[in-house]
Interface confidence: medium
């Protein structure tokens, strides 16, 4: 092409028109262009309708183009990634009708001061939304209702003073939330819901530590390993969690998670009873919490409570029965073992009433991996690593999830705009998954002791899985021998809503509790 550079990478025709001092779309671009870079030009205004002839376009970079207006007309049916970062947009165009397949939208570093309620209507496929570095002060309550597949949300570096309580409602796949460097002083009760949030960035806000902060304090305690400090240019999985980075603005930078809450109502941080069944009197011993109540209620949706019941396992069984193919970040341990921090059983456990069904059925048959056929135009090329499809709730184990997307912030000063290093013609919703590994079964029978004052530790090790069994008859404090096969006693089934960033777990895994 006389103006732009054309190249082919992994089945994509990539056209690079960056830094050409263009004021409009160049003529005669290849009709089968799939990735179009128009970064660092002087477009000022741009109409998406001019791209309608490019029916295979899956990624469009319009960052740093001095855009003050984006006209949304026509339809780009397979466009998956739109980068509008580092422009001068004062309002977010309504993209839903024009870009129905959009999975990644980056409007970072513009001049947005507010978002209308229906700003994201029609963007039902959206997985990543980046609004960093704007001038947003508030958000409409139902802003994210149209985007139930959202996985990454960046609202960092704005002027937000408060958040709508239900902002994250229904976002079961959300794994990364960036709220750092705003003017937030509190988090409304119930804000985080009950689903897993593996990566949260909350530092750089003037948190007001009073009785209203107790819900947030408790969430921080329960999710300490999921709270990070943003470092420019560092992959999110390489960062170290740092819950102490969330500091009270009115208490000499005292960490919010340690705020004592003296004089506050006893159940002040319980929030909704669905979210936490809070122990009103607790002693904190470093990372350990001593529970002084005998009822442990787990919500039906998984959340990140790291204080699962404490069980004693035989050392010999761990030596001989740990799975041989552990995830790289998962280590065998001989110490006492609990539920992993990011796993919560899907049941309510009362000490006075617990047994297991008599004949749990073990399984080592993984569900079939989805595959994709060649060739299919790709609706969303920008993700840099394979994402698993939404996990089924059936208990059969499936193959290990693949690595998560490598970065939640594609646009941060002064990094260049995001591009797709390895796009393909594969459709995003059904990637080819690695070969599944049969799930080993632990066969041993130590005693489970459930104490009313059990020590509960957040650090735990995942063991293995079988099919779930129900909770039935009644016993108290200890669980007697049951009429079951001698080597396989019972399991508690858990459900992990979003495991793509979890180093240990597949969504359908559960934990065997031998007796």
């Amino acid at each position: 092409h006389p103006i732009c550079e054309v190249s082919k990478v992994a089945s994509h025709l990539e056209v690079n028109c960056d830094k050409r001092n263009l004021t409009a779309l160049p003529p005669d671009l290849p009709k089968d262009t799939t990735i179009l870079h128009l970064s660092e030009n002087l477009l000022y205004t741009f109409s998406l309708a001019t791209l309608m002839p490019y029916t295979r376009l899956t990624q469009l970079n319009l960052d740093r183009c001095e855009l003050t207006k984006l006209q949304v007309d026509g339809t780009l049916p397979v466009l998956g990634t739109l980068d509008l970062s580092h422009n001068q947009l004062q309002s977010l165009p309504l993209l839903g009708q024009t870009l129905p397949a959009l999975t990644v939208l980056d409007v970072s570093f513009n001049r947005l001061t507010s978002l209308p309620l229906g700003a994201l209507r029609g963007l039902g496929e959206l997985q990543e939304l980046y609004l960093k570095g704007n001038e947003l002060k508030t958000l409409p309550p139902g802003l994210l209702t149209p985007t139930p597949k959202l996985e990454k949300l960046s609202l960092a570096n704005n002027n937000l003073t408060e958040l709508p309580a239900g902002l994250l409602n229904g976002l079961e796949n959300l794994d990364t939330l960036l709220l750092q460097e705003n003017s937030l002083y509190t988090i409304p009760k119930g804000f985080f819901g009950s689903h897993l949030l593996p990566f949260a960035f909350l530092h750089g806000n003037p948190w007001l530590c009073n009785c209203e902060i107790l819900y947030f304090r408790r969430w921080l305690q329960d999710n300490a390993e999921n709270v990070y400090v943003w470092k420019q240019g560092v992959d999110v999985k390489a960062m170290t969690s740092n819950v102490a980075s969330v500091q009270c603005d009115n208490s000499d930078k005292f960490p919010v998670y340690k705020y004592p809450g003296k004089g506050c109502p006893t159940l002040g941080d319980e929030g909704d009873t669905d979210l936490y069944d809070y122990y009103p009197e607790e002693d904190t011993e470093g990372d350990k919490v001593r529970a002084t109540r005998t009822v442990v209620k787990f919500p039906t949706k998984a959340h990140t409570t790291p204080w699962g019941l404490f069980y004693s396992w035989s050392t010999a069984s761990l030596d001989s029965q740990m799975p041989s193919s552990l995830h790289p970040t998962q280590e065998s341990t001989k110490e006492q073992t609990t539920f992993p921090p990011r796993w919560t059983p899907n049941f309510t456990l009362h000490m006075e009433s617990i047994t297991f069904s008599k004949t749990p059925k073990s399984t080592t048959e993984p569900t079939p991996s989805p595959t994709t056929s060649e060739p299919v135009p790709e609706p969303a090329p920008n993700m840099t690593t394979l994402e698993p499809t939404p996990s089924p709730t059936t208990p059969e184990p499936t193959s290990e999830p693949a690595p998560s997307p490598t970065t939640p912030e594609p646009t941060s000063e002064p990094a260049p705009s995001p591009t797709t290093p390895e796009p393909t013609s594969e459709p995003a919703p059904s990637p080819t998954t690695p070969e599944p590994t049969p799930i080993p079964t632990i066969a041993t029978s130590p005693t489970i002791l459930v104490s009313a004052t059990s020590l509960i530790t957040p650090k735990s090790t995942f063991l293995t899985t079988t099919k779930p069994v129900s909770l039935l008859e009644s016993t108290k404090k200890t669980i007697p021998e049951l009429d079951q096969p001698p080597k396989l006693r019972g399991v508690l089934q858990g459900h992990l809503e979003s495991s793509r960033n979890d180093p240990f777990l597949h969504p359908d895994f559960c934990c065997l509790l031998p007796l």
Epitope: A10, L13, L386
Partner: antibody, heavy 118, light 113 residues
């Protein structure tokens, strides 16, 4: 049965021009990317040019500006116009069909020899 | 450009032998989006056009005998002939189909011992 038949090779002087043709049959020609790959005598394979089903051409640096690939879907024919030929362009030129949007070559012609010599 | 390096450049083997040819790329051919490695293998006999054996590292082209298999990931790849047959004596080329310009290895000639 897929068939690719090259023609147009021969002896040409340095600086001269030559046009190669590849007649395709046995498949829907317009739906597939097509390529030229060459092999110098006693040497390995070297990709020369490709054209997508939509008509987008691309080339390696070694022939950029000298060679032009084109296709006539109505005639099921692929072309390679070679200008400013050099001695190092001497090779057997193969016409090859790509699989879908991918860029490996599932069918090859028998090749046509181009000799650039004075 | 991605450089492809094959080894050995030639080898002598007997019918029934297990033969392994390696191919290294100067950068990764793994597309993390779909976990596929964009590498193909071809067989060429003297005076003939190349024939596709394997694509995406390990997928055998239809009609290719099962004794041919491909493996590897990232930058290191292998073509294995489990039991060499008389018709397998030929030159074998790897090709990356990840990023243009498409590049081939220099070839490995498999000769009769």
């Amino acid at each position: 049965e897929v068939q690719l038949v090259e023609s147009g090779g021969g002896l040409v002087q340095p600086g001269g021009s030559l046009r190669l043709s590849c007649a395709a049959s046995g498949f829907t020609f317009s739906s597939f990317a097509m390529s030229w790959v060459r092999q110098a005598p006693g040497k390995g394979l070297e990709w020369v040019s490709s054209i997508t089903s939509a008509g987008t051409p691309y080339y390696p640096d070694s022939v950029l500006g000298r060679f032009t690939i084109s296709r006539d879907n109505s005639k099921n024919t692929l072309y390679l116009q070679m200008n400013s030929l050099r001695a190092e362009d001497t090779a057997v030129y193969y016409c090859a069909k790509s699989r879908g949007y991918e860029d490996y070559f599932d069918y090859w012609g028998q090749g046509t020899l181009v000799t650039v010599s004075s | 450009d991605i450089q492809m390096t094959q080894s050995p450049s030639s080898l002598s083997a007997s019918v029934g032998d297990r033969v392994t040819i390696t191919c290294k790329s100067s950068q990764s051919l793994l597309n993390s989006r779909n976990q596929k490695n964009y590498l193909a293998w071809y067989q060429q006999k003297p005076g003939k056009a190349p024939k596709l054996l394997i694509y995406f590292t390990s997928t055998r082209e239809s009609g290719v005998p099962s004794r041919f298999s491909g493996s590897g990931s990232g930058t290191d790849f292998t073509l294995t002939i489990s039991s060499l047959q008389p018709e397998d004596f030929a030159t074998y080329y790897c090709q990356q189909h990840y990023s243009s310009p498409w590049t081939f290895g220099q070839g490995t000639k498999v000769e009769i011992k």
